[in-house]
Interface confidence: low
Amino acid sequence: GWVWNQFFVPEEMNTTSHHIGQLRSDLDNGNNSFQYKLLGAGAGSTFIIDERTGDIYAIQKLDREERSLYILRAQVIDIATGRAVEPESEFVIKVSDINDNEPKFLDEPYEAIVPEMSPEGTLVIQVTASDADDPSSGNNARLLYSLLQGQPYFSVEPTTGVIRISSKMDRELQDEYWVIIQAKDMIGQPGALSGTTSVLIKLSDVNDNKPIFKESLYRLTVSESAPTGTSIGTIMAYDNDIGENAEMDYSIEEDDSQTFDIITNHETQEGIVILKKKVDFEHQNHYGIRAKVKNHHVPEQLMKYHTEASTTFIKIQVEDVDEP
């Protein structure tokens, strides 16, 4: 019968001919009376056999990631009679893995959006690298993820690639972060290969800033001839937030005379001071009112940022008009 062990050849072998093993018939007494032949895909080009001894060699560098298995056939013939000594037999050569592929992030580019001020532990995104090496061969394709850039705001779970928030972030200070993740094979042992990816993490706005008046005092004038409903000037607050979180409502906080009103221009986010009652220079030639500004939408959980509304003082001078 045929005698052989399982055949393995390491991929990427640099030797010009690498001895894989020996195929022989147990009838072969070593007197060179038998001839061994190799048939099938790769025979003669990738693999050769010593016709006298049955020793098999690989004569080409093999890439396991391209092809991991070769199925060949062996024959043994008695040189004197030309007859087969053994029935033709099929055998397998397996290409064994070496760690020659670095992990690759195939879903790049990564981008995620997370609300600013999210608590520690909030899941941002999961990045996944794949390694073309053999997952069943040692640790060649066992990956560990680590953070190269992004501390102290982000962390990555070493075995899953899940990125989480590790420190609260304020969009008004920085609205996006570049996180660099490394995936290392061989579970980080010597000889490990690595790949990196960048993750753009954008912070979405939450209403964590109240509007604040740019001026603590505004001076306006109104003619005593102005009819009610006249716009006598504008006031403006600044809100570090954006979008609907920066929409604001102006209102009167103090106006003993009840002469003025403030309406909000929701296009420009300005407060328009309106004359509610006609004024009379001879009766009162100046007024002092206090205005306040608040955000339009403030979720309950963000009320702590909006405890005291910003206020401003408005001095209004009445202009005299000659009366007949």
């Epitope: 200070l173 920085q174 609205d175 996006e176 570049w178 740019k214 001026e215 570090n240 954006i242």
Partner: antibody, heavy 120, light 110 residues
Framework: QVQLVQSGAEVKKPGASVKVSCKAS????????MSWVRQAPGQGLEWMGI????????TYAQKFQGRVTMTGDTSTSTVYMELSSLRSEDTAVYYC?????????????WGQGTLVTVSS | QSVLTQPPSASGTPGQRVTISCSGS????????VNWYQQLPGTAPKLLIY???QRPSGVPDRFSGSKSGTSASLAISGLQSEDEADYYC???????????FGGGTKLTVL
């Protein structure tokens, strides 16, 4: 982290022009203003002007009006500052600095600076 | 002559508290947010305090800013040798329609 990388040092003769570049990366280039600030040897910081890269809107300091031109190229995320009719007093380190999303918000990131020497 | 006035120099011994003032007018400090920059020798300026009193991440809480009316100040407590640098205040000026810097204050740690 936001990065602003400026072009290298220049030596110019009086009357010539200089064009300094500032390449931005790792943020949305078109969202933020970019200012140019200079610093003469041993002197303080002097604001020259500001550009919004998305529309190319510019505001220049009165002192540099007519001599300075700021431009932006959104395809390469680069802003440029050109100063003409150079004189020896223009010898300085020129910095680009990223502004805010509003004209009056702080400069949070600065380039490494470009030394421009004006000498005959 | 700068639009914003700062003392040209300030000094203190390690551990001490020093304050640098910045005086302006209604059209700049009186109307807008004050920012402070630190410039270590031979390097580009770095944002130290923004919108009057906010610290960017990485800036120690030894640095604090405040504003009142048309003046602002930067306070450094627990002074350290690495704080030796030039400090500039900066603000947007509504009248000039542009940014203005203080003349800078050279801080020496004795």
């Amino acid at each position: 982290q936001v990065q602003l990388v400026q072009s290298g040092a220049e030596v110019k003769k009086p009357g010539a022009s200089v064009k300094v570049s500032c390449k931005a990366s790792r943020y949305t280039f078109t969202s933020y203003y970019m200012s140019w600030v200079r610093q003469a040897p041993g002197q303080g910081l002097e604001w020259m002007g500001i550009i919004h890269p998305s529309g190319g809107d510019t505001t220049y300091a009165q002192k540099f009006q007519g001599r300075v031109t700021m431009t932006g190229d959104t395809s390469t995320s680069t802003v440029y500052m050109e100063l003409s009719s150079l004189r020896s007093e223009d010898t300085a380190v020129y910095y680009c600095a990223r502004g805010g999303i509003k004209l009056w918000l702080h400069f949070d990131y600065w380039g490494q600076g470009t030394l421009v020497t004006v000498s005959s | 002559q700068s639009v914003l006035t700062q003392p040209p120099s300030a000094s203190g011994t390690p551990g001490q508290r020093v304050t640098i003032s910045c005086s302006g007018s209604r059209s700049n400090i009186g109307s807008n947010f004050v920012n402070w920059y630190q410039q270590l020798p031979g390097t580009a300026p770095k944002l130290l305090i923004y919108t009057n009193n906010q610290r960017p991440s990485g800036v120690p809480d030894r640095f604090s800013g405040s504003k009142s009316g048309t003046s602002a100040s930067l306070a450094i407590s627990g002074l350290q040798s690495e704080d030796e640098a030039d400090y500039y205040c900066a603000v947007y000026d509504e009248s000039l329609q542009g940014w203005v810097f203080g003349g800078g204050t050279k801080l020496t740690v004795l």
